[in-house]
Interface confidence: low
C-alpha cells in the first residue's frame, strides 16, 4: 500500500511566490510621469515575473515632517486620484496580483514616524488600515519600525485590525536592523507578521557564514513563515558584490518563505541604498530610451528589453526561478535541510512528502570547487540519491536536464545549481 499523503498546510497567497516593491512610481516608470494610471500599464510585466504581490508606495499625502499635513487617507495628487487607485486595484485583481500599500507616515521627512506625537500617528495608521481595507487593499507595509516607540504593541494592534477584516490580509513591517534578537522580539508578539530586515546583508558573503545566518534564523523562528530579502527597501546591488547577484536570486527563491524584491532587482539595476541617507530612487531601465540623457546607445544588456531577449540574462533567470517557486510543492511549502558544507559553499534540500525534491548548491567562492555532497546529517525522509538532474545553473553553458553525480559535483566560481530528484519510497 502506498504511504498516506501528508496533509497540505494552509497556504496564504503571499506563501505562493515573490513580492515586488515599487517604492517610487517615477523611478519605476522612468518616463517622468510616475503615476498610478501609468503603473497600470506595467501590470503585464509584473505578471510575466510571476510575482504574487505588489508593495506600493507610500503614495499618501505627506507634508515633510508635518503631522497635521500628513493624511494617510488621501493619495498625493502627484500620483493620481482615488479613482486611479481603484482602477489599479481592479486591474491587478484580474491578473491575480495583490496590492500591498505602504503606509509609512512621514516618508518625505527626516523621521518616518515623526519624532513626537506617536499616539496621534498610530491613530492615523489605525484609521488608514480600516479605510484602505474597505477599499479593497490586500495588505500593508510599514517601514523603519525601529523609529517607532512601542513598535511591538502597535504592530500587534494593527495586525488585529488587518486579520480581523480577513485572514487573507497581510501586514509587512520593515526594519533596518540586522540584529537577530531585535528581529525576534518584534516577531514574538506578532504571529503572522512578515518582517523585512537587513539580517542577511550583515554577512561576509561566504558559504559558511550564509549557511549559519540562514539556519540560525530558521531555527530561531521555528515553524513561523519567513520572508527573505537583504533590506527593507533597497536594491540587491546595493548590498551584494555584483558576482553574487545570481547566486542570491537562486537562494532567495528557494529558501522556505516569501522572497521580497525591489523593482530592478530582476535586471541587476544599480542604485544607492545607504542606511540613514536619503537616496533618490533609480530609474528603471525598460529599454534604451530609459536613459533620458544618453545620446548614443548605452548597454542594451542592462535593460528589460535587452534582457528579455537573452535567455542567459539575469531577468531570464529571475523569471525561471519565480515560475518554479510558484508551482513546485517542495519549493512552495517543503521542509528545509541544510547539508554539511565547506567554507566556500552552502547547500540544502527542499522536500515535501512524495513530490519531486530540490537540491540547491551555492558556491560563494572566487574559485571553482568540487563538492562531495553526502547526506550524513539528513533525516531518513530526505535522503540524497547518487545523482540528480540539473534544472538550472546561474552560469551559462551547463547541459540542463543532465544527471549530475552528487559525490563529484564541480562548480564554477560564484555558481549556483538547482537540481531535482524524485521521491523514492
Amino acid at each position: 500500500r502506498a504511504p498516506r499523503c501528508r496533509d497540505l498546510p494552509v497556504q496564504k497567497w503571499w506563501h505562493t511566490g515573490a513580492l515586488y516593491r515599487i517604492g517610487d512610481l517615477q523611478g519605476f516608470q522612468g518616463n517622468g510621469a510616475g503615476n498610478l494610471a501609468g503603473l497600470k500599464g506595467h501590470l503585464d510585466y509584473l505578471s510575466s515575473l510571476k510575482v504574487k504581490g505588489l508593495v506600493l508606495g507610500p503614495i499618501h499625502k505627506n507634508q515633510k515632517d508635518d503631522v497635521a499635513g500628513t493624511d494617510l487617507l488621501q493619495i498625493d495628487p502627484n500620483f493620481g486620484s482615488k479613482e486611479d487607485f481603484a482602477s489599479l486595484l481592479q486591474s491587478a485583481k484580474k491578473k491575480s496580483i495583490r496590492i500591498i500599500l505602504d503606509l509609512t507616515p512621514n516618508y518625505q521627512g527626516e523621521n518616518s514616524w515623526f519624532s513626537t506625537q506617536v499616539d496621534t500617528v498610530a491613530t492615523k495608521v489605525k484609521d488608514a488600515l480600516e479605510f484602505w481595507l474597505q477599499a479593497g487593499v490586500d495588505g500593508f507595509q510599514v517601514r523603519d519600525i525601529e523609529n517607532l516607540k512601542d513598535a511591538s504593541s502597535f504592530l500587534a494592534e494593527w495586525q488585529n485590525i488587518t486579520k480581523g477584516f480577513s485572514e487573507d490580509r497581510l501586514l509587512i513591517a520593515g526594519t533596518n536592523s540586522s540584529d537577530l534578537q531585535q528581529i525576534l522580539s518584534l516577531l514574538e508578539s506578532n504571529k503572522d507578521l512578515l518582517l523585512t530586515s537587513s539580517y542577511l546583508s550583515n554577512s561576509s558573503f561566504t558559504g559558511e557564514h550564509t549557511k549559519s545566518l540562514v539556519t540560525q534564523y530558521l531555527n530561531a523562528t521555528g515553524n513561523r513563515w519567513c520572508s527573505w530579502s537583504l533590506s527593507q527597501a533597497g536594491l540587491l546591488t546595493s548590498f551584494l558584490p555584483a558576482q553574487l547577484l545570481r547566486l542570491y536570486q537562486l537562494m532567495l527563491f528557494t529558501l522556505p518563505g516569501t522572497p521580497v524584491f525591489s523593482y530592478g532587482d530582476e535586471i541587476g539595476l544599480e542604485a544607492a541604498a545607504v542606511p540613514g541617507q536619503p537616496v533618490e530612487a533609480p530609474v528603471m531601465l525598460w529599454d534604451e530610451s530609459s536613459f533620458p540623457f544618453i545620446s548614443a546607445a548605452g548597454s542594451a544588456n542592462m535593460t528589460v528589453k535587452g534582457q528579455s531577449e537573452d535567455p542567459g540574462s539575469l531577468l531570464s533567470l529571475f523569471r525561471r526561478l519565480s515560475d518554479q517557486r510558484s508551482k513546485e510543492r517542495s519549493l512552495l511549502h517543503g521542509d528545509f535541510h541544510a547539508l554539511s558544507s565547506g567554507p566556500g559553499f552552502f547547500s540544502y534540500i527542499r522536500h515535501w512528502d512524495q513530490n519531486e525534491r530540490f537540491l540547491v548548491v551555492l558556491n560563494f567562492g572566487d574559485v571553482g570547487l568540487s563538492a562531495g555532497l553526502q547526506a550524513s546529517d539528513l533525516p531518513a525522509s530526505a535522503s540524497l540519491p547518487a545523482k540528480a538532474d540539473l534544472l538550472l545553473s546561474t552560469q551559462p553553458g551547463r547541459d540542463e536536464g543532465s544527471p549530475l553525480e552528487l559525490e563529484r559535483l564541480k562548480l564554477e566560481p560564484h555558481e549556483g545549481l538547482l537540481l531535482r530528484f524524485p521521491y523514492v519510497a
Epitope: T237, S238, A242, L269, E270, A271, A272, A273, V274, Q277, V279, E280, A281, P282, V283, L285, F291, P292, F293, I294, S295, A296, G298, S299, M302
Partner: nanobody
Framework: QVQLVESGGGLVQAGGSLRLSCAAS????????MGWFRQAPGKEREFVAT????????YYADSVKGRFTISRDNAKNTVYLQMNSLKPEDTAVYFC??????????????????WGQGTQVTVSS
C-alpha cells in the same frame, strides 16, 4: 550634497599621458554614476566618458575611444581618467560630474547634478 575636486591636469607633449583624478565627498560615492566632460576655449562642453556605480559599465566618446580609460575606486571615493596618446585637440578644461539619481552615468551634461571646478589639460605639439 556632493563635492568634487579634480586634480592631475597639466602641460604634456603630444603622444604623452596624464591621469586625472576626481575625489568625491559628502555622500555615498558608490551610489553615483560618474562622468568626465571637457570644454575647449570658445567651444561647448563635451562628453568624454562615463562609468556606472559599480564600475562594471563604461562608455566613451568616439574621439577618445581606445586612448582614454575611465575607472573608479569606490573605497577611495575617486574616479580616474587615464589619458594616453594625447593630441593637441585634447587641450581643454576637464570636468568631473556626479549623478545621484541613476547609476548608469549619462553622455549629456543635463544628466549630472554635481560638478567639479575643472582641471586644465594642455597638449603641446
Amino acid at each position: 550634497q556632493v563635492q568634487l575636486v579634480e586634480s592631475g591636469g597639466g602641460l604634456v607633449q603630444a603622444g604623452g599621458s596624464l591621469r586625472l583624478s576626481c575625489a568625491a565627498s559628502g555622500r555615498a560615492f558608490s551610489s553615483n554614476g560618474m562622468g568626465w566632460f571637457r570644454q575647449a576655449p570658445g567651444k561647448e562642453r563635451e562628453f568624454v566618458a562615463t562609468i556606472s556605480c559599480s564600475g562594471t559599465s563604461t562608455y566613451y566618446a568616439d574621439s577618445v575611444k581606445g586612448r582614454f580609460t575611465i575607472s573608479r575606486d569606490n573605497a577611495k571615493n575617486t574616479v580616474y581618467l587615464q589619458m594616453n596618446s594625447l593630441k593637441p585637440e585634447d587641450t581643454a578644461v576637464y570636468f568631473c560630474a556626479a549623478d545621484t539619481r541613476h547609476c548608469m552615468g549619462y553622455t549629456k551634461d543635463e544628466g549630472y547634478a554635481y560638478w567639479g571646478q575643472g582641471t586644465q589639460v594642455t597638449v603641446s605639439s
